[in-house]
């Protein structure tokens, strides 16, 4: 289980139309459910129940976004519509270039994601927990445009990313 270095950039627009960027670094782990490779895209939060819908109630996103899913406590969803791996697959089917799970409330999900799948996803499936997860979810819920870059080595220079 390799460390995933996640850099999240929050874009805030000023009244003048300029953008200010705020960069936050956090770490997670690549799970065996997906590939250990880099990915980058706009963050889209996905509700674990929303992933149950087969009939795409909302627009399908263009390919290349990073899905963020905060998993529930298992007792709140005793009969989940999909396994955690199934939710990752559903997100990738809908165009996610990577999926990040916040497993803080459901640490059992780590084992589920690491049960060596015969057919792992070709995109990275990362999990975060604790302080890193709190940081991520606070950014995701700020209602600003945010992008995530996932790497399997520490970022070198913060200036080299997100050339807009």
């Amino acid at each position: 289980k390799e460390t995933a270095f996640v850099e999240v950039v929050l874009f805030e627009s000023s009244p003048s139309g300029d953008y200010t960027t705020y960069t936050t670094g956090l770490t997670g782990r690549f799970s065996r459910a997906g590939a250990t490779l880099s990915a980058e895209g706009e963050i889209v939060q996905m509700h674990p129940l929303g992933l149950c819908n087969n009939n795409d109630e909302e627009d399908l996103y263009e390919y290349g976004w990073v899905g963020v899913v905060k998993l529930e406590q298992p007792e709140l969803d005793p009969k989940p519509c999909l396994t955690v791996l199934g939710k990752a697959k559903r997100a990738v089917q809908r165009g996610a270039t990577a999926v990040i799970f916040d497993v803080s409330e459901n640490p059992e999900a780590i084992d589920q994601l690491n049960q060596g799948s015969e057919d792992p996803l070709k995109r990275p499936v990362v999990y975060v927990k604790g302080a890193d997860a709190i940081k991520l979810m606070n950014i995701v819920n700020k209602q600003k445009v945010a992008r995530a870059r996932i790497q399997h080595r520490p970022p070198r220079q913060p200036t080299e990313y997100f050339d807009m």
């Epitope: 889209v44 939060q45 996905m46 509700h47 674990p48 129940l49 929303g50 992933l51 819908n53 795409d56 109630e57 909302e58 627009d59 899905g67 963020v68 905060k70 529930e72 406590q73 709140l76 809908r94 979810m137 606070n138 995701v140 819920n141 700020k142 209602q143």
Partner: antibody
């Protein structure tokens, strides 16, 4: 950015009414929800219905509103609420509100509200 | 559907004082809770989202906290302009719907 409701007024019991919400300076193509929330005189807020402004146009209703109320996006700047089989219990101020897009499968909180339009159901 | 229970229904406090409003969800909604202020004859105004994030332009005297099923709105250094009715709202899932609490009237003496 602003929202304005119209179409309220006095209606007979079992009658019908269509409310319209007109948006100014709002891009309906951006992911968001347009919703109706009502408030009976001297009472609290009650969610009625929402429509997703993206191309899917998915609609969501409070359980009590299903079958009687219909929310629609009628143009790039207007949303309507068609209300049928009205009773005195439907007497309220009806607010149009814009819901922030939180993510796929989430509901929304309301960042922008219209001033409201009063609907009175009485004979 | 989620049911939001707000307490107390009414609270009175002096200028400069502090009031605490509680909101309880019938099931866990994580941190997906908003708080609104409504004055007579006006539409509601968003104060806080994601349980504790202050909406732009809202004074830091307003503080939201909590997660899961228990949430609190605390207003400190009360001003006369804070006299209003406050509502909590869950926005957990489009499947479970949108739900408001019953409201809490804040009277400032």
């Amino acid at each position: 950015q602003s929202l304005e409701e119209s179409g309220g007024g006095l209606v007979q019991p079992e009658g019908s009414l269509t409310l319209t919400c007109t948006a100014s300076g709002i891009d309906f193509s951006a992911r968001s929800y347009m919703c109706w929330v009502r408030q009976a005189p001297g009472k609290g807020l009650e969610w009625v219905a929402c429509i997703y402004t993206g191309s899917s146009g998915s609609t969501y209703y409070a359980n009590w509103a299903k079958g009687r109320f219909t929310i629609s996006k009628t143009s790039s700047t207007t949303v309507t609420l068609r209300m049928t089989s009205l009773t005195a219990a439907d007497t309220a101020s009806y607010f149009c509100a814009r819901g922030a897009y939180v993510g796929y499968g989430f509901a929304a909180y309301f960042t922008l509200w219209g001033p409201g339009t009063l609907v009175t159901v009485s004979s | 559907d989620i049911v939001m229970t707000q307490t107390p229904a009414s609270v009175e406090a002096a200028v400069g004082g502090t009031v605490t409003i509680n909101c309880q969800a019938s099931q866990s909604i994580s941190s997906y809770l908003a708080w609104y202020q409504q004055k007579p004859g006006q539409p509601p105004k968003l104060l806080i989202y994601y349980a504790s994030n202050l909406e732009s332009g809202v004074p830091s005297r307003f503080k939201g906290s909590g997660s899961g099923t228990q949430f609190t709105l605390t207003i400190s250094d009360l001003e006369c302009a804070d006299a209003a009715t406050y509502y909590c709202q869950a926005y957990y899932s489009s499947i479970t719907g949108w739900a408001f609490g019953g409201g809490t009237e804040v009277v400032v003496k």
